[in-house]
Structures are given as structure tokens and as C-alpha cells.
């Protein structure tokens, strides 16, 4: 098979038929050495998801339920193409599956147990696997059969197309369950004229369902959506409040040689040429042949999957948690309103070894998981794999596009007793000099730059921020001559003067040994004109504070800060001299663990914080000898965060405008991915 | 800076037990944790068990109720008790002391412990 060749998967002879008019047509379109299509047939997309695994395929179109079995081992398939609905300037590629209820009802998510249901059909998504997938472990049992479990669940039901011999209660709201529009209350427009006419108590339907069916206002609102916390919020809110987000359908392909940029290319030049209105010869979305062959009649178009985005991030945690549970029907032992060990998230081997360390001395509350970089951290907890960690402001941006929220902010100022109900301002992002130097904030370009890390807050966002408002443009890299800004392209200026060692040179850990506030100083001590960190650094690095053998005779008095005014100031003034006012860095978690997390690090601090005196012989949780493993190592307390519990709120409208506006040059694919 | 040496490994066949030791060269006693970790051929370190000065104790869930890990503070020395030994126990066991705050990179000779039959 050539390798611009796409063999394309389909599952009956009328997908075979037009996937033989696509190869055809595709073929007089694009050059002889652009992308072609070949026809595999298969006789089900389970069989096409195998011949792809095996290198027999390369691509087919799927469900989400179907993206999910793809994804499992031994197929690791991952999506790589979108179908969108709606238009081109507001491209629908998910809908949110949702629990509608009326508003003058008083219950929660929690006291479904004994209400009176509707769906939209057995095994469909919105309707039927994602609540109940979601609920199952609060099924009584025996949870098999399924129906049976539902049936006692709720008080009585409306269930299109379940069987009312077997599990009347199934149908108790809609006599017979039909499974048509014959039944007034079969699919999506019915299951909430179930809840409209007050059979039901709670709907389970699509996001669109309720405008749909209510195009005015004031009567959408008589209605509310029941979120997983167990609060609920307006039918608008529905992106903040609900069961899951569900994709529409998805070209999938191999994760390891999966001709994913010969798929894109095929695809984007398909949709140029044979999409909704293009051509009378060949459409790509409706066939003479039948409906919905190889992609949906409904789709507009395609839109490329960010690289970044598996198959896990893309159909989210609650959706495969819904389904991992209806299929393998397993739930924990412990009742589930108790906190299960919380798994914290280790960047490399230093944070992973004093997070073992951690979870010896809580007894086993807290474990340990390890990723490499602080965005595959934060992939980790958004699908399940650890909980938490603590981030610089920068990540709690991109963390909180990605659905984490804060829990806690590390203070550094605040002593004890009032310590953690305090919302300190936050710390100083300063960029400091040599005082040997003749450097001001106005004659950095061709200078040596030394950085935290891409992304972070002080060692990068309000530099580079107040820097693009400056030149306008995003060549970060041409404006200095060299430096080291963790994270950066292996092959960038910004990773030459990093010092590794080598596997880990420009890597955004701490393997990286400019890494960091400290790592970033250090740099400046060795190689750099210009380090950007926090205005605490210096201070904590010299003076024989830190005794490794580069720090321990550096003097305070050597090093100066750069005022935005063309000035310099002394390392004690970082009040009148500082680039802004970067938020703490806070503990983020998912929503559904964020309580959890917050009460066993409450108690953890009591036991491990900073009241303990002799780290040498006891476990400290906030000390690394410099090295801000897991937290930083100035931190006096974790604090509660009151009402500022969403990302916007505890970063604050500027540094979230200002983050936002550096979004043009972001280099992060997580956030890519995340606001797809 | 106590210096730990590990020692006790060998050859076992399945099912079998041994027990390590890692003697330290100054006083263990006012060392918060210790534990032991391991890495299998062509594998990354992975974390065992752990002891605080306290003596609580915890266990990588699957060594749990095979393994024992120990300390004798008035020898300096930590153990670690391993029975019902499986083929995928075979690797390199290192201890550690935590103790220096830089979680260091630096670690002992360890020693080999191989599960075959």
C-alpha cells in the first residue's frame, strides 16, 4: 500500500459503494502525489477497529461509545478527526449530556433514589448509559440485570424501547415503552415533555434539548440542571453543569503510525471540494445509498483533533467513567461519600521520591503518581489517574481551561494561627540582574535570558506578556540571544544555555538543573544577564542559605531588580520594583475530588507543615533544601479559598487577561487540546 | 551524611523467602523515613515499602501482606522480610534514608534479588 494511501474502514455494502465514489472522486480532485483513499470492508465497526490495530486499515468513523472501545487495549486507537455540526464560525463537535428538573423541586443529584425518571431510550447516551453509568454505584443490588436495578432505583420510569413485560416499572410513565414516535415521550423532545407535563421528575437528555423545545426565556426558566456536586445551575450553564460532554463522531486512527496528517490532509481537502454545498457529483455528508454512511448526513464539516488529545482526554472523565462502569460493573468497597486515598501528582524523580516519603507518613492517605512534565500532571488528573498537585499560577490557568478548579493556595507571609483563612495578595514577579551589570528593563534585547519554566508565572507569563506588548510579536527567541526557559523547543535559542544533563536538557522538571525559581537564579549566577523569578529568590539563595556549592558564597548586595520605568532597585525593595503581582500558586484537583483533597491536606499540614521544627528528623512538607519539591519550599501554610474557587476568581480578571493575551504565542499543546 | 549499604540478595525459586538488610554507617535513629525501592531489568525505580522513625509502616499494593520492612535502631539497620516471592519481584533493591532533602540521584550498589525456578 503506497504510503500517501488512507484505507479507508467500512461496514456494509452501501459504505462500501460510496467509499468507492470517494476514492473515485478524491482521485480527479488531488494531484498524483497527494493523499488517495483505498475501501477495506468490514462487517461491523468492531471488526474495523480490530483491522485498524492490525494495520489493515487506517480509518474509520465512530460513536463515542465506539471511540471508548477503540481506545482500549490491545486496539490503543485515538481520534484524530472530528465530524462539527452548527456553522463554521461556531462549530459544534460535543454536546453535554444533562439532568434536566423543574425549578420548584428541592432535590440533588445525590436524591435521584425514588424520583420518577425519563430517558430518551434504552442504551442511548444522553438518555440512558451516561446517568446511569454515573449512578450505577448507587444501584441497589444485585446491579444485574441492569433494568431491574433502574427499576428499583427509581419509582417509576419512562424507558422508550425497554422491555414492559420483564420491568414495568420501566414504563410505568409511558405505557409499552414504545420505541417510536408513536410514544409521546420516546427520545429526546419526549423524555422532557415527560418532565414538562409532570410525570416525571427528572430528565435526561441533551444540552440542545431544552432550547429546542422552549424558545423563550422565561419559560427555560422553570427549569434547572442537576450538576454532579450535587448543586445545581441555570439550563444556560450546561458547559459548568453536567453529567458529561459526549463527542459527536470521530475519525480514529493508530496511536503509533497512524497516518493522522495524511488523514487531516485527505479530509480537509475532501471538505474543500465535496462538503455541505460544494458539488452536485458527490457529497461527502448524504449518499443516494442510505443514511449517516461513512460520516453523519448532519455533520458541516471536519476539524483536526490537537495532538495532544487521546482518547481519554477526548471523551472526558465522566463519560468513560459511565461507561467503564455499566461495562465492567465493578464498584469500590468503600461507601462512596468517603475519601479514598488522594494520588498526588510527582514531577520526576526528586518530587516522586519526597512524595514516597509522603505517603509512609500519612499512613498510606496519600500515593503517588509521576509524569514528566507539569501539563502531563495535570492530563493525569483530569482523567482520573492522580488528583491533585499544586501549581504555579500559570498551570491553574491551563489547568482550569481544562475543568480542574483550586482548592487551596499556598501563603507565604501569613504567620500561623490565622494562616489558613488568609487570602494573602500573592508574590512579586521581578527580573533580576547582576549589579555589576548595566542592564535596564529598556536594553534587554540580544541579552541572556534565564527563565522558570515556559508557561509559569514569574519566570514567564508577565515577562513575555509585558514583553509582546512591547515588540508584537511572538519570536521570544530572537529577541534575546540565548537563554533557558524550560519547556521551550529542544532546538530553540531559549533551550541553549540550559545545562541538563543532556536526556533532560530544556525538560521542564526539576531533572533540568535551571528548572525553577532556584534553577532559573542559578542560571543567571552561571551564564545569564537576566534571571525572571519570584522577588523571594535571591534572598533564599545567598547569604549561605543555600549550601550547594554554586550558592554558597553569593551575596545579595551582587544582584539588583529592574524597574518597568528603566530603573534599577536594591533586591529589598521588590514592593517599588517588580514586573507585577503574580496570584500564589494553589493545589488543583477535579471537581468531584476537590473536597477530599482539601480535608486531608488540612490534616496533613497540621501534621507536616511548617509548625514542625526539625526537619532533619522529621517529615516536613514544605522543605526541599531549595528545590520546591511538590510545594514551594517558603510556603507557611496551604489557605483555604472561600468564593475564590474557580480559576478566574483566584487568578484574578488581569493576570487571566493578561494570560489570555499570551495565548497567540502559547506553546502548549495541553491547552490546545483543552479548549478544542 | 549516613552512607547505607544493602546486602542479602541471591537467587530464589517462587514461593521462596529472603530477607535484606541495609546497614547504615552513622546512627539511624534520628532519620524520619526509610525505605526500600527496586529496579527490574530495563525498568524504571519503582518505590517498595517505607518505615517512619515511628516504626508505621506502608507497602506498594502489590507486595502487601508478602513483604515486612523493618528497623533496628540500635543496630542501624533496616530490614526488609520478603516471602511468597514471585518471578516479578526479580530486581535490583536499594534502600534510602530521605534524610538529605534534595532527594537525591545518588544510591547504593543495591542488591540483586532473582526469582527463578
Known amino acids: 500500500v503506497p504510503e500517501k494511501s488512507v484505507r479507508w474502514c467500512a461496514v456494509s455494502e452501501h459504505e462500501a459503494t460510496k467509499c468507492q465514489s470517494f476514492r473515485d472522486h478524491m482521485k480527479s480532485v488531488l494531484p498524483s502525489n497527494g493523499p488517495s483513499v483505498a475501501c477495506v470492508k468490514k462487517a461491523s465497526h468492531l471488526d474495523c477497529i480490530r483491522a485498524i490495530a492490525a494495520n489493515e486499515a487506517d480509518a474509520v468513523t465512530l460513536d463515542a461509545g465506539l471511540v471508548y472501545d477503540a481506545y482500549l487495549a490491545p486496539n490503543n486507537l485515538k481520534p484524530v478527526v472530528a465530524e462539527f455540526y452548527g456553522s463554521k464560525e461556531d462549530p459544534q463537535t460535543f454536546y453535554y449530556a444533562v439532568a434536566v428538573v423543574k425549578k420548584d423541586s428541592d432535590f440533588q443529584m445525590n436524591q435521584l433514589r425514588g424520583r420518577k425518571s425519563c430517558h430518551t431510550g434504552l442504551g442511548r447516551s444522553a438518555g440512558w448509559n451516561i446517568p446511569i453509568g454515573l449512578l450505577y454505584c448507587d444501584l441497589p443490588e444485585p446491579r444485574k440485570p441492569l433494568e431491574k436495578a433502574v427499576a428499583n432505583f427509581f419509582s417509576g420510569s419512562c424507558v422508550p424501547c425497554a422491555d414492559g413485560t420483564d420491568f414495568p416499572q420501566l414504563c410505568q410513565l409511558c405505557p409499552g415503552c414504545g420505541c417510536s414516535t408513536l410514544n409521546q415521550y420516546f427520545s429526546y423532545s419526549g423524555a422532557f415533555k415527560c418532565l414538562k407535563d409532570g410525570a416525571g421528575d427528572v430528565a435526561f437528555v441533551k444540552h440542545s434539548t431544552i432550547f429546542e423545545n422552549l424558545a423563550n426565556k422565561a419559560d427555560r426558566d422553570q427549569y434547572e440542571l442537576l450538576c454532579l456536586d450535587n448543586t445545581r445551575k441555570s439550563v444556560d450553564e450546561y458547559k459548568d453543569c453536567h453529567l458529561a460532554r459526549v463527542p459527536s463522531h470521530t475519525v480514529v486512527a493508530r496511536s503509533v503510525g497512524g497516518k493522522e496528517d495524511l488523514i487531516w490532509e485527505l479530509l480537509n481537502q475532501a471538505q474543500e471540494h465535496f462538503g455541505k454545498d460544494k458539488s452536485k457529483e458527490f457529497q461527502l455528508f448524504s449518499s443516494p445509498h442510505g443514511k449517516d454512511l461513512l460520516f453523519k448526513d448532519s455533520a458541516h464539516g471536519f476539524l483536526k483533533v490537537p495532538p495532544r488529545m487521546d482518547a481519554k482526554m477526548y471523551l472526558g472523565y465522566e463519560y468513560i467513567t459511565a461507561i467503564r462502569n455499566l461495562r465492567e460493573g465493578t464498584c469500590p468497597e468503600a461507601p462512596t461519600d468517603e475519601c479514598k486515598p488522594v494520588k498526588w501528582c510527582a514531577l520526576s524523580h526528586h518530587e516522586r521520591l519526597k512524595c514516597d516519603e509522603w505517603s509512609v507518613n500519612s499512613a498510606g492517605k496519600i500515593e503517588c503518581e509521576s509524569a514528566e512534565t507539569t501539563e502531563d500532571c495535570i492530563a493525569k488528573i483530569m482523567n482520573g489517574e492522580a488528583d491533585a498537585m499544586s501549581l504555579d499560577g500559570g498551570f491553574v490557568y491551563i489547568a482550569g481551561m481544562c475543568g480542574l478548579v483550586p482548592v487551596l493556595a499556598e501563603n507565604y507571609n501569613t504567620p500561623n494561627p490565622n494562616c489558613e483563612n488568609t487570602a494573602e495578595e500573592g508574590y512579586f514577579a521581578v527580573a533580576v540582574v547582576k549589579s555589576s551589570s548595566d542592564l535596564t528593563w529598556d536594553n534587554l534585547k540580544g541579552k541572556k535570558s534565564c527563565h522558570t519554566a515556559v508557561g509559569r508565572t514569574a519566570g514567564w507569563n508577565i515577562p513575555m506578556g509585558l514583553l509582546y506588548s512591547k515588540i508584537n510579536h511572538c519570536r521570544f527567541d530572537e529577541f534575546f540571544s540565548e537563554g533557558c526557559a524550560p519547556g521551550s523547543e529542544k532546538n530553540s535559542s531559549l533551550c541553549k544555555l540550559c545545562m541538563g544533563p543532556s536526556p533532560n536538557l530544556c525538560e521542564p522538571n526539576n531533572k533540568e538543573g535551571y528548572y525553577g525559581y532556584t534553577g532559573a537564579f542559578r542560571c543567571l549566577v552561571e551564564k545569564g544577564d537576566v534571571a525572571f523569578v519570584k522577588h523571594q529568590t535571591v534572598p533564599q539563595n545567598t547569604g549561605g542559605k543555600n549550601p550547594d556549592a554554586w550558592a554558597k558564597n553569593l551575596k545579595e548586595e551582587d544582584y539588583e531588580l529592574l524597574c518597568l520605568d528603566g530603573s534599577r532597585k536594591s533586591v529589598q525593595e521588590p514592593a517599588n520594583c517588580h514586573l507585577a503581582r503574580a496570584p500564589n500558586h494553589a493545589v488543583v484537583a477535579r471537581k468531584d475530588k476537590a473536597d477530599c483533597v482539601q480535608t486531608l491536606l488540612l490534616d496533613q499540614q497540621r501534621m507536616f507543615g511548617s509548625s514542625v521544627t526539625d526537619c532533619s528528623s522529621n517529615f516536613c512538607l514544605f522543605e526541599s533544601k531549595t528545590k520546591d519539591l511538590l510545594f514551594r519550599d517558603d510556603t507557611v501554610c496551604l489557605a483555604k479559598l472561600h468564593d475564590r474557587n474557580t480559576y478566574e476568581k483566584y487568578l484574578g480578571e488581569e493576570y487571566v487577561k493578561a494570560v489570555t493575551n499570551l495565548r497567540k504565542c502559547s506553546t502548549s499543546p495541553l491547552l490546545e487540546a483543552c479548549t478544542f | 551524611e549516613v552512607q547505607l549499604v544493602e546486602s542479602g540478595g541471591g537467587l530464589v525459586q517462587p514461593g521462596g523467602s529472603l530477607r535484606l538488610s541495609c546497614a547504615a554507617s552513622?546512627?539511624?535513629?534520628?532519620?524520619?523515613?526509610m525505605a526500600w525501592y527496586r529496579q527490574a531489568p530495563g525498568k524504571g525505580l519503582e518505590w517498595v515499602a517505607g518505615?517512619?522513625?515511628?516504626?508505621?509502616?506502608n507497602y506498594r499494593d502489590s507486595v502487601k501482606g508478602r513483604f515486612t520492612i523493618s528497623r533496628d535502631n540500635s543496630k542501624n539497620t533496616m530490614y526488609l522480610q520478603m516471602n511468597s516471592l514471585r518471578a516479578e519481584d526479580t530486581a535490583v533493591y536499594y534502600c534510602?534514608?530521605?534524610?538529605?532533602?534534595?532527594?537525591?540521584?545518588?544510591w547504593g550498589q543495591g542488591t540483586l534479588v532473582t526469582v527463578s525456578s
Open positions: 534510602t534514608d530521605y534524610s538529605s532533602r534534595y532527594y537525591h540521584d545518588y
Open positions: 552513622g546512627s539511624i535513629f534520628s532519620i524520619a523515613t
Open positions: 518505615i517512619t522513625r515511628s516504626g508505621s509502616t
